[in-house]
């Protein structure tokens, strides 16, 4: 036997071994290198365990074929410089395409996974985005039906609408004397008198569990029936229409008495202290507000995915009583405006393109506009910067009752300047107001300047939406107050009025609007410096009774593939207030302008039921001179929005709401008209007793954004 | 893929012998060390030589140096050239592609 | 030639038990070793090739390890399967000097 046993048979002759670093040869490229237990980086904070384990795998796998091709690369190197390799290095060798191939594989592999596992989180966070708003909109549209039914509930006090109810509108009744008791009791339990034996919110606390239950349509026994039996009964009082159409239950001052009483514009003009006008491209630094308002829609409007019933608990297409009537021309003749972005009333259209233009620029809106309106209702002038979205059907039909008494219409609204804003459906689009007045158009000057305003604190501002006093003078305006001391949505003549927004413009009288938002334009990031400092300008003071933004929302036409843009985009990031600009005028209209109620009228339901109608005297309905929410809807009631977006949390707003001292721009406040008649009055619902002027619902705080 | 070792036999000392590595399902490459190694009866492995099929260089064990020799015949087989057998040389002899392929062997037997 | 020693020549162990191997080369030759596994009969199958990485198909149980001049193999959780002898072998080249790929003596494994 050979004695070089030690020494034998191998496979490879023997030289000198390559450095100790290196490792060797590698046989089968198969033969991974035992990997690390990294996982894969770059991927989403929340990732689903199999997407975990999976980049685990590939980013292992990933290093050890980097791992290996460094090796092959070493042997290949060494190879050119004439060193040999052995058998495996130079099989690893012979795989070197392979390596690599699986290299650009396993990187790509490990690029799709994460983006992967990035749209998964992205889809995760949308879920969970998309069900936190559906849960916000359920507490919404939860809340706007608690506001109809309180709603509801306060006019059953009312006599004539009662008689209404039981006698029906088409000789049909709607309630039998027997439901209107039942409705009675229940008010009872949900606004009960205040027992000061109670702490508040226990008092409520019991308010609250009647109105769930009865949201929930429980079988659970209240009042001598079922809570369930109330919602239906409920159910079919809203379903009847009967409170959105007009009934003429006026027993304010008509239109003789009033127009005796009307100063003249010139008057008027004497006395109003216009703000100094300012060059409209400054940036106001004043804070500005954010308002929002998705009351008037149509019950296509926002849904998200399925079409709402249309009777559960409100049809949703909204008449407006006051229909945009004629507006008499002599009733605020053109005088000259302090901010008029348009100086006459068709200046050049290059320059009126550039004026829009630089407006744009400063708003960074993301709106689509359009030069002329898509609807040229008698050739009025069309400001250029009207924002753009579906055009509205201009063959709707134009007609609307006449006013009884047309001259009140420019003032009769203003006792319900505080009602629209109730909206817990409104349309969020966050309005920046800010408080000064540049590039304004019809600038009322009749407004008086900030700097003379006083806000009477009456109490706190626990409203559902802001609702803004007045100078203190104003603030007991009666019905009688002239029609040219009211805030005019527009004035005659060359001067254009804002647009009313958040009416929807399916009913006839808004068709005539023309500026629509675009709402499938993105939302401009709230990071961005300008967002709350937009110069949004609006009239000062239009009636906020049917607007919280100056522009007129064009939402009926929205189809449901844009919902979820909408959706998305105004849920998406609460952080980002939706800019609109705010001085987009709408020219003079025959037909057009804010609907008020034809006259201005007592609701005859006093101030609470039972109560003495002198106690209610300037209040005209719901709330005490405090200015709480409880105002408006004499003639009518639209109906709250039913639709299941019901308005974009006022969560979105990043700052408390201030209305201290001054009049915010573009609201009224919803001060109670009327001196008239006053009486005692039975109590149908056994509300005997003192005046109670907190008649609504738990108030809620609005909120203010800087 | 495999090999396959013959011309084993049994010869007489001092004889010559020639055996032959065949390839089945490959040929032999550029890539290749074709290595011959032998294994007494209850003996451990005994390296004899390899060949590099690239270049043709070969290595043989020291004690193996001037009576064996390596080559390739064609493109799927190898030799292995023995001289001046002696009954030390007796052994299983198998042919190796590297050091991963191994032939069955095939046993030489060097007896008078 | 650079020659390789394998110890212990035998070891005996019980099934799940744990054996270890070492091989030391008369210098160092990096990481250019492999192991085998032999049973009777059959040629050599290469079990780890440059120290520590293991062949396809090859359980794990089975861990190479080691650089340079001293080497060893360690496998766990014996199986009577194990039983047989494993050697380990230079596999270094090189265009200048010749280290030869020697085979260690061997080392029988016996699973009780």
């Known amino acids: 036997p050979s004695a070089t046993s030690h020494s034998g048979s191998g496979s490879k002759s023997s030289g000198p071994p390559p450095p100790s670093g290196s490792s060797g040869s590698e046989a089968a490229a198969g033969a991974a290198a035992p990997a690390s237990q990294h996982p894969a980086t770059g991927t989403g904070a929340v990732q689903t365990e199999a997407m975990k384990q999976i980049l685990g795998v590939i980013d292992k796998k990933l290093r050890n074929l980097e791992k290996k091709k460094g090796k092959l690369d070493d042997y290949q190197e060494r190879m050119n410089k004439g060193e040999r390799l052995n058998q495996d290095q130079l099989d690893a060798v012979s795989k070197y395409q392979e390596v690599t191939n699986n290299l650009e594989f396993a990187k790509e592999l490990q690029r799709s996974f994460m983006a992967l596992s990035q749209d998964i989180q992205k889809t995760i966070k949308k879920t969970a985005r998309r069900e936190q708003l559906m849960r916000e909109e359920a507490e919404q549209k939860r809340l706007k039906t608690v506001l109809e039914l309180q709603y509801v509930l306060d006019k059953l006090g009312d006599d004539d609408v009662r008689t209404d109810l039981k006698q029906g509108l088409s000789g049909v009744p709607i309630l039998s004397e027997e439901e209107l008791s039942l409705l009675d009791e229940f008010y009872k339990l949900v606004d009960p008198e205040r027992d000061m034996s109670l702490r508040l919110n226990e008092q409520y606390e019991h308010a609250s569990i009647h109105l769930w239950d009865l949201l929930e349509g429980k079988e659970k026994p209240v009042c001598g029936t079922t809570y369930k039996a109330l919602k239906e009964i409920v159910e079919r009082v809203f379903q009847s229409n009967y409170f959105d159409s007009t009934h003429n239950h006026q027993n304010g001052l008509c239109e003789e008495e009033e127009a005796a009483s009307a100063p003249t514009v010139e008057d008027q003009v004497a006395e109003a202290e216009p703000e100094p006008a300012e060059e409209y491209t400054e940036q106001s630094e004043v804070e500005s507000t954010e308002y929002v308002n998705r009351q008037f829609m149509a019950e296509t409007q926002f849904s998200s995915g399925e079409k709402e019933q249309v009777d559960e608990w409100t049809v949703e297409t909204v008449e407006v009583v006051n229909s945009l009537q004629q507006q008499p021309q002599a009733a605020s003749p053109s005088v000259p405006e302090p901010h008029s972005l348009t100086p006459v009333a068709q200046s050049d259209p290059l320059v009126r393109r550039q004026r829009v233009q630089d407006l744009m620029a400063q708003m960074q809106g993301p709106y689509n506009f359009i030069q002329d309106s898509m609807l040229d209702f008698e050739n009025q002038t069309l400001d250029p910067a009207i924002v753009s979205a579906q055009p509205m059907n201009p063959t709707q039909n134009m007609d609307m009752p006449q006013l009884v008494c047309p001259q009140v219409h420019s003032e009769s609204r203003l006792a319900q300047s505080n009602q629209v804003p109730v909206q817990p459906e409104a349309t969020q689009v966050p309005l920046v107001s800010s408080t000064s007045e540049g590039y304004t158009a019809s600038q009322p000057l009749y407004q008086p300047s900030h700097a003379t305003e006083q806000r009477p604190q009456k109490e706190p501002m626990d409203q559902i939406q802001a609702t803004i006093s007045l100078n203190t003078d104003q603030t007991t305006a009666s019905s009688s107050l002239p029609a040219a001391s009211q805030p005019q949505v527009f004035q005659a003549g060359t001067s254009k009025p804002l647009h009313s927004s958040g009416i929807n413009v399916n009913a006839a009288p808004f068709q005539s609007m023309q500026t629509v938002f675009n709402m499938n334009a993105p939302v401009p990031p709230a990071n961005e410096p300008e967002t709350l400092k937009q110069q949004s300008q609006y009239q000062a003071t239009y009636n906020q009774s049917f607007s919280s933004q100056p522009h007129q929302v064009e939402q009926t036409e929205l189809q449901q593939d844009q919902l979820q843009t909408v959706v998305g985009t105004y849920h998406g990031s609460q952080d980002q207030p939706h800019q609109v600009p705010g001085n987009h005028q709408q020219p003079p209209q025959q037909n057009t302008g804010f609907p008020r109620s034809s006259q201005p009228y007592y609701n005859s339901r006093g101030v609470s039921r039972g109560g003495s109608r002198g106690a209610r005297g300037l209040m005209n309905g719901y709330r005490g001179p405090a200015n709480g929410f409880r105002g408006g809807y004499d003639g009518y009631r639209p109906s709250f929005s039913n639709t299941p977006n019901s308005g974009y949390s006022q969560s979105q707003f990043t700052a408390p709401r201030d209305y201290s001292g001054y009049q915010r721009d573009g609201y009224q406040q919803n001060f109670k008209r009327g001196s008239g008649q006053s009486g005692p009055r039975g109590a149908p619902r056994g509300r005997g007793g003192p005046p109670r002027p907190n008649r609504g619902m738990p108030q809620m705080n609005t909120q203010q954004v800087n | 893929q495999s090999l396959e070792e013959s011309g084993g036999d049994l010869v007489k000392p001092g004889a010559s012998l020639t055996l032959t590595c065949t390839a089945s399902g490959f040929s032999f490459s550029g890539s290749y060390y074709m290595s011959w190694v032998r294994q007494a009866p209850g003996k451990g492995l005994e390296w004899i030589a390899y060949i590099y099929i690239g270049d043709g260089v070969t290595a043989y064990a020291n004690w193996a140096k001037g009576r064996f020799t390596i080559s390739k015949a064609s493109s799927t087989t190898v030799t292995l050239q023995m001289t001046s057998l002696t009954a030390a040389d007796t052994a299983t002899y198998f042919c190796?592609?590297?050091?991963?392929?191994w032939g069955p062997g095939t046993l030489v037997t060097v007896s008078s | 030639d650079v020659v390789m020693t394998q110890t212990p020549a035998s070891v005996e162990a019980a099934v799940g038990g744990t054996v270890t191997i070492k091989c030391q080369a008369s210098?160092?030759?990096?990481?250019?070793l492999a192991w085998y596994q032999q049973k009777p009969g059959q040629p050599p199958k290469r079990l780890i090739y440059d120290a520590s990485n293991l062949d396809s198909g090859v359980p794990s149980r089975f861990k190479g390890s080691g650089s340079g001049t001293d080497f060893t193999i360690t496998i766990s959780d014996l199986e009577c399967a194990d039983a047989a002898t494993y050697y380990c072998?230079?596999?270094?080249?090189?265009?200048?000097?010749?280290?030869?790929?020697?085979f260690g003596g061997g080392t029988e494994v016996v699973v009780k």
């Open positions: 210098q160092s030759i990096s990481s250019y």
């Open positions: 190796a592609r590297g050091n991963k392929l």
């Open positions: 072998q230079c596999t270094a080249v090189s265009s200048a000097t010749i280290y030869g790929n020697a």
